[in-house]
């Protein structure tokens, strides 16, 4: 459960959350469930497009997100699908294709007009004053990332790497995603056996940066497999 | 206008139950986690625990846990904390807050609960 | 638990004055730091996340600055609507934890 897994120490103790895993080119972070984040259910389609295994709609490119590829199938099983145009069924933002946010169920045009009579739909906190806001509240930068002019800085709510400023990715942090730094040569990293083996991951790092990879570290060697130590490292 | 509107003081007996209720609006209520947090007479704020409205998922600071149970109910957009074999320790101000990202960005009024025999 | 430290619990001040208050914690807590707002009243109110983003809505004059294990608050141009409790809050780790406060009051 939620509860167990954001009390157990083997979570509460992870190191510092300064950035995320290592993934397949292009991924943002190390894929983890929708945990405490709106609009986490997996929405189940047969849209099958892409059969690249998935955990979390970051796993996948602009036009995709992350479900399982037949209704009512094996939800441990998700691969990347087509997002989803205007007028089509959704659950979630992150299903509509760029340019589109979900509501009432619907992908509907996130244009500047349209969008500032339905701001309550998709209210998040501001970006540190980094996008206009109404009441306080800013925008969701997940609808579509090219609507904006600045990109959201360290620390910003994100949904998404893409919308998150160069050098940063979109990693989970708590009940949220955040903007964080990709990760320089040396730092601590993340590096999953396998696609769907790390469990819950409540603090996520970002991926190594360009030239780098997430390794055990070589003094590390000879720990036991538990406590082996990964950082980033030149190729 | 995003609000959270907390129910009204409360006087309960050493032993009992009491529950608070934290109604919002302005804002679509699965969208946001909601917060509780404590703050007893002329001390410092204590984080009780998270619900995600949209799921129901629950996570307690494990000095509340088994105590304190969060619930919302959707079709009202409202959030609520129960707090169950009071003692005199549990007098203080509880409040609710809103957010999505790791900060407690809008706050309730606060609602004050008195344990007295 | 992260400890997290107001070592000044009240602090007075003439308009105007430039004002800092600090917070400590326990151990690293890189960015993760948040600054609140209570007033009198018992309103709470956010002023600044991941250590110096201020939020939206909030005076200019208040800056957050810092990092790892020590952070501070400063607001620049005391005015009269400044007068509060002032608490700094660590979201590195489960659970969140909150200093003790710092009162401000006026001279």
């Known amino acids: 459960t939620l509860n167990s897994v954001l009390n157990s120490n083997a979570i509460k103790n992870l190191p510092p959350p300064l950035g995320g895993a290592a993934g397949h080119p292009g991924s943002a972070v190390s894929a983890a469930p929708g945990i405490l984040y709106p609009g986490g259910n997996k929405y189940q389609t047969i849209d099958n497009y892409q059969p690249y295994p998935c955990a979390e709609d970051e796993e996948c490119g602009t036009d995709e997100y992350c479900a399982s590829p037949t209704r009512g199938g094996d939800a441990g099983v998700q691969i990347c699908l087509a997002c989803r145009k205007r007028r089509k069924r959704c659950m979630r933002h992150a299903m509509c294709c760029p340019g589109n946010y979900c509501k009432n169920g619907i992908c509907v045009s996130s244009d500047q007009n349209h969008f500032r009579g339905e701001i309550e739909e998709t209210i998040t906190e501001s970006f540190g004053n980094d996008h206009s806001t109404l009441d306080g509240y800013s925008r969701r930068t997940t609808l579509s990332s090219k609507m904006y002019h600045t990109k959201g800085q360290e620390g910003s709510v994100c949904l998404r790497s893409s919308d998150c400023a160069s050098g940063l990715c979109c990693a989970r942090h708590f009940w949220s995603k955040i903007c964080k730094p990709v990760l320089k040569e040396g730092q601590v990293c993340t590096k999953h056996r396998r696609k769907g083996s790390h469990g819950l991951e409540i603090f996520q790092r970002c991926y190594c940066g360009e030239g780098l990879s997430c390794r055990i570290q070589k003094d590390h060697h000879q720990a036991s497999n538990s406590s082996r130590l990964h950082t980033c490292q030149r190729h | 206008e995003v609000q959270l509107q907390q129910s009204g003081p409360e006087l309960v007996k050493p032993g009992a139950s009491v529950r608070i209720s934290c109604k919002t609006s302005?804002?679509?209520?699965?969208?946001?986690?909601m917060h509780w947090v404590k703050q007893s007479h002329g001390k410092s704020l204590e984080w009780i625990g998270v619900i995600d409205p949209s799921n129901g998922d629950t996570s307690y600071n494990q000095k509340f846990k088994g105590r304190a149970t969060l619930t919302v109910d959707k079709s009202s957009s409202t959030a609520y904390m129960d707090l169950r074999s009071l003692t005199s320790e549990d007098s203080a101000l509880y409040y609710c807050?809103?957010?999505?990202?790791?900060?407690?960005?809008?706050w309730g009024q606060g609602t004050l609960v008195t344990v007295s025999a | 638990d992260i400890q997290m430290t107001q070592t000044t619990s009240s602090l007075s001040a003439s308009l105007g004055d430039r004002v800092t208050i600090n917070c400590r914690a326990s151990?690293?807590?890189?960015?993760?730091l948040n600054w609140y707002q209570q007033k009198p009243d018992g309103t709470v109110k956010l002023l600044i996340y991941?250590?110096?983003r201020l939020h939206s809505g909030v005076p200019t004059r208040f800056s957050g600055s810092g990092s790892g294990t020590d952070f501070s608050l400063t607001i620049s141009n005391l005015v009269q609507e400044d007068i509060a409790t002032y608490f700094c809050?660590?979201?590195?780790?489960?659970?969140?934890?909150f200093g003790g406060g710092t009162k401000l009051e006026i001279k």
């Open positions: 807050s809103s957010t999505t990202g790791p900060w407690f960005a809008c």
């Open positions: 302005g804002y679509t209520f699965t969208e946001y986690t």
């Open positions: 151990q690293d807590i890189s960015n993760y």
């Open positions: 809050q660590q979201v590195h780790t489960l659970p969140p934890t």
């Open positions: 991941y250590k110096s």
